[in-house]
C-alpha cells in the first residue's frame, strides 16, 4: 500500500514538475526589465530563451525570435541545452514510469522488472530536475552579473549633455517556475527511488521443501514473506506474492489531467 502510494505520488509530482519545466522553457519571461526606479513604464522589455519581447503601454506587444544560432551567448546556449536535456530525460522517465507503476499490469511483468524500471525513471527524474535547476541557476547568475555591470554603467553620456539609460534586467517569472518545477521533478525522482526499494524482492526464489514429521503428513512450504494468498501450490517455482489476488490499493488508477497557466 505505502509503496504504491509512494510510487504513484512520485509519478504525479514528477509529471507536474516536468510540465513546469516545459512551461518554463517555453515562457518568454526569463528576464524582465527592472522597474525599481520607474514602476510606470511606457515600454516594457522581457526576454526568454527563444525570443525577446516588448510590451508597449498602448497594449501592443512585439516579439522577435533569436534567429541566429552562432551569434547567441554561449551561456544562453548552455541554458537551452540543459533545459532540453531536462525535458527529454523527464519525458523518457515519465514513459518508463507509466509501465513501472504497480497499479498498472502489463502482461506477466515481474516485480523485479517493475522495480528496475521505477529506479531508472527515478534516476531520470532526478537528473531532469537537476538539469532544470542548473539551467535556471546559470541564467539567474548571468542576470545578476549583467545587472550589476549595467548598474555601474547606468548612465553614459556625451559630455554629460545627453543621457542614455541602459535597460537593466531582473529575474522573470520563468526562473521561479523553473526552480519550483526542477525541485518537484527532483522530489518525484527521489520518491520513485524510495518506492523502488519497496518493490524490489528482498529474498530470492525458494524451492519448496517438504519436511516430514514422524506421525504427521503435513508439508510446510515456506513462501515469499509478502504472501497473502496462503499456501498455494508453487510447482513452477513462482514467487508466491506474485499471485493473482490484488489488494485494494492495486486497483487501476488513471492519472488526472492538470491545467497549467
Amino acid at each position: 500500500m505505502a509503496v504504491t502510494a509512494c510510487q504513484g505520488l512520485g509519478f504525479v509530482v514528477s509529471l507536474i514538475g516536468i510540465a513546469g519545466i516545459i512551461a518554463a522553457t517555453c515562457m518568454d519571461q526569463w528576464s524582465t526589465q527592472d522597474l525599481y526606479n520607474n514602476p510606470v513604464t511606457a515600454v516594457f522589455n522581457y526576454q526568454g530563451l527563444w525570443r525577446s519581447c516588448v510590451r508597449e503601454s498602448s497594449g501592443f506587444t512585439e516579439c522577435r525570435g533569436y534567429f541566429t544560432l552562432l551569434g547567441l551567448p554561449a551561456m544562453l546556449q548552455a541554458v537551452r541545452a540543459l533545459m532540453i536535456v531536462g525535458i527529454v530525460l523527464g519525458a523518457i522517465g515519465l514513459l518508463v514510469s507509466i509501465f513501472a507503476l504497480k497499479c498498472i499490469r502489463i502482461g506477466s511483468m515481474e516485480d523485479s522488472a517493475k522495480a528496475n524500471m521505477t529506479l531508472t525513471s527515478g534516476i531520470m527524474f532526478i537528473v531532469s530536475g537537476l538539469c532544470a535547476i542548473a539551467g535556471v541557476s546559470v541564467f539567474a547568475n548571468m542576470l545578476v552579473t549583467n545587472f550589476w555591470m549595467s548598474t555601474a554603467n547606468m548612465y553614459t553620456g556625451m559630455g554629460g549633455m545627453v543621457q542614455t539609460v541602459q535597460t537593466r534586467y531582473t529575474f522573470g517569472a520563468a526562473l521561479f517556475v523553473g526552480w519550483v518545477a526542477g525541485g518537484l521533478t527532483l522530489i518525484g525522482g527521489v520518491m520513485m527511488c524510495i518506492a523502488c526499494r519497496g518493490l524490489a524482492p528482498e529474498e530470492t526464489n525458494y524451492k519448496a521443501v517438504s519436511y516430514h514429521a514422524s506421525g504427521h503428513s503435513v508439508a510446510y512450504k515456506p513462501g515469499g514473506f509478502k504472501a497473502s494468498t496462503g499456501f498455494g501450490s508453487n510447482t513452477k517455482n513462482k514467487k508466491i506474492y506474485d499471485g493473482g489476488a490484488r489488494t485494494e490499493d492495486e486497483v487501476q488508477s488513471y492519472p488526472s489531467k492538470h491545467d497549467y497557466v
Epitope: 515600454v43 522581457y46 516588448v54 503601454s57 498602448s58 497594449g59 501592443f60 522577435r64
Partner: antibody, heavy 118, light 113 residues
Amino acid sequence: QIQLVQSGPELRKPGETVKISCKASGYTFTAYTMGWVKQAPGKGLEWMAWINTYSGVPTYAADFKGRFAFSLETSASTAYLLINNLKNEDTATYFCARGVRGNSMDYWGQGTSVTVSS
Amino acid sequence: DIVETQSPSSLTVTVGERVTLSCKSSQSLLNSGNQRNYLTWSQQKPGQPPKLLIYWASTRESGVPNRFTGGGSGTYFTLTISSVQVEDLAVYYCQNTYSFPFTFGTGTKLEIK
C-alpha cells in the same frame, strides 16, 4: 469606420467644473488605450494622460494631476475628462486620441474647446 | 522629463522643394529590447486635429504619402518631405513615446511661398 466624437464647446467661469466626453466607434474600445492632449490657443500640443481602457488605470503628466480626472464608461465606449476648479489657463482645445503601436496616436477626436472666463 | 527641441521653428518653402525638419531629444529614445526608436511625427493643419505621419521614428502610417520619410536614431531625428505640396502647409510635431510623459516638441511651422 473608426471615429472619435467629442462633446461640444464649453464656456465656464473660474472655479467651476467641466466634463468632456469622447465617444469611440468602429473598433473594440477596450483593445486600445486612450490619450488626452491639450492645446492652448496659438500654442503647441501638450500631452496630458494615457488611459488603459481595459483596466481603467490612467498615467498622468505631472501638470495634470489633482484637478484633472480621467474616467471611462466602457459599456458606452466613452472616455471622459473632468476638470475641477477651472482656471483661466485651462482655456484650450482638448483632444482625445486612440493609442496604437509605437505608443503613437492614430485617430483623433475633433477637439473640444473649453473657455474659462469670468 | 524628456525634452524635444525642434528646429527650425518656422520654414517657408516653395512647392516641389525638398525640406528636412529636425528634432533633438534630451535623452535617447532607442529601446534596446527591439532596437526601435520611440519617436512620432504628427502633422496639424489649421483648425484640425493632429494627424499621425510617422511612428517608431521611421515607420510611415498607412495612408501617409511616401514623400514623408522619418529618419534618425537615439537623440537626433529628422522628417523629410521630398517634394513639398500645397496641402503640406501645417505645423509638424515630434513626440517622445518612449517614456512618460509623452512630451511633444515645440513644433515646426511649414509655410508655402
